[in-house]
Interface confidence: medium
């Protein structure tokens, strides 16, 4: 049975806390850190940073599970991205989606001027 | 003085409601409508759909303001995307950002299995 993605994400958050000391052992490394809180726009950079981190981290043990979970999350996001243009529907349904997107932007995004 | 983006978004939502009848006058048109609610992953498709809609809509009058505002929103999002990889920081700061992203994913994303 496939584990729900929400469970994978929660588990990953726990593992991230547990492995912080190991992951931050290389203090010379520099990774891309976005300068705003709209994380959803920066998924490419987040996973690019994770690839760098993965290649610089001593592997083995339970940290493997963390990277496996992060890989599952990336696959999930890629699948979701594929679904963006999967269906072509009527204008009114497109407008519903646009309206929802702008509603989310209006309430949940961190916006400056 | 630059209008805050939050104001532009709210104004666009109002304009969208006001112009719905005009925008849906071509019932044969088909536009990309994502099959999930993680709008943030589908920004490319949303604006691609808007370009199609713009080219098919009778122009002039107050609907111009709607398309101008949508263009401002696109520019804002593009600027935000540029800021994703602008800075390189230490691992712990990258991990903070990753943690925030996963936290948002865990609480705000619509996730299936």
């Amino acid at each position: 049975m496939e584990i729900p993605m929400s469970t994978v994400v929660k588990e990953t958050l726990t593992q991230l806390s547990a492995h912080r000391a190991l992951l931050t052992s290389n203090e010379t490394m520099r990774l891309p850190v976005p300068t705003h809180k709209n994380h959803q726009l920066c998924i490419g950079e987040i996973f690019q940073g994770l690839d760098i981190l993965k290649n610089q981290t001593v592997r083995g043990g339970t940290v493997e599970m963390l990277f496996q979970n992060l890989s599952l999350i990336k696959k999930y996001i890629d699948r979701q991205k594929e679904k963006c243009g999967e269906e072509r529907r009527r204008t009114r349904q497109f407008l519903d989606y646009l309206q929802e997107f702008l509603g989310v932007m209006s309430t949940e995004w961190a916006m400056e001027g | 003085m630059e209008i805050p983006m939050s104001t532009v978004v709210k104004e666009t939502l109002t304009q969208l409601s006001a112009h719905r009848a005009l925008l849906t006058s071509n019932e044969t048109m088909r536009l990309p409508v994502p099959t999930h609610k993680n709008h943030q992953l589908c920004i490319g498709e949303i604006f691609q759909g808007l370009d199609i809609l713009k080219n098919q809509t009778v122009r002039g009058g107050t609907v111009e303001m709607l398309f101008q505002n949508l263009s401002l929103i696109k520019k804002y999002i593009d600027r935000q995307k540029e800021k994703c990889g602008e800075e390189r920081r230490r691992t712990r700061q990258f991990l903070d950002y990753l943690q925030e992203f996963l936290g948002v994913m865990s609480t705000e994303w619509a996730m299936e299995g």
């Epitope: - | 409601s17 006001a18 009848a21």
Partner: antibody, heavy 119, light 107 residues
Framework: QVQLVQSGAEVKKPGASVKVSCKAS????????INWVRQAPGQGLEWIGY????????RYNQKFKGRATLTVDKSTSTAYMELSSLRSEDTAVYYC????????????WGQGTLVTVSS | DIQMTQSPSSLSASVGDRVTITCKAS??????LSWIQQKPGKAPKTLIH???RLIDGVPSRFSGSGSGQDFTLTISSLQPEDFATYYC?????????FGQGTKVEIK
Amino acid sequence: QVQLVQSGAEVKKPGASVKVSCKASGYTFTNHHINWVRQAPGQGLEWIGYINPYNDYSRYNQKFKGRATLTVDKSTSTAYMELSSLRSEDTAVYYCARDYGNFWYFDVWGQGTLVTVSS
Amino acid sequence: DIQMTQSPSSLSASVGDRVTITCKASQDINSYLSWIQQKPGKAPKTLIHRADRLIDGVPSRFSGSGSGQDFTLTISSLQPEDFATYYCLQYDDFPYTFGQGTKVEIK
């Protein structure tokens, strides 16, 4: 407040036509589609079609195509539904309903107009 | 045309009961479904749209769920004013089609 007020009851002979009106008030008439729905006595609801008052574009249920005609008069904010070649099975209450601007559900309904077709 | 099959066609319940009505579409309608209440001799009234969104002013005892083909309307605690006929309506594709209705009667 937003209201749709329909014309009064009609009695028609088979083969005749009927024109039901639906006067809108309390909102910008051209911003919302007007749908027409009917309900035969003791039966369920049936969608006839809608009209977009902005450009007079109308869409019909195939079942009524050719017999139903949807029109609007923007100057009086009134929508009309005309049904021709009436038969006894067209006896029903006819409702107009406004499409809400965001998300397309019917948010306001007229009070209904009873059309009786009888010889 | 998309067929909407509602069940049950009628039910008897008491004040305070939890009532569930289901609606099945003959094909995927996404979440383009609304629930409509009609009392005898009155115009219909929309309660829920987009499958689960309660319309302003509608009591919170009404709730909707589902997507795709299977949908449910739930009244958590039936009140005297809830005795009526309930219809589902799909507005995903033309022609819009209604379920045949569920009459909720007093036991």
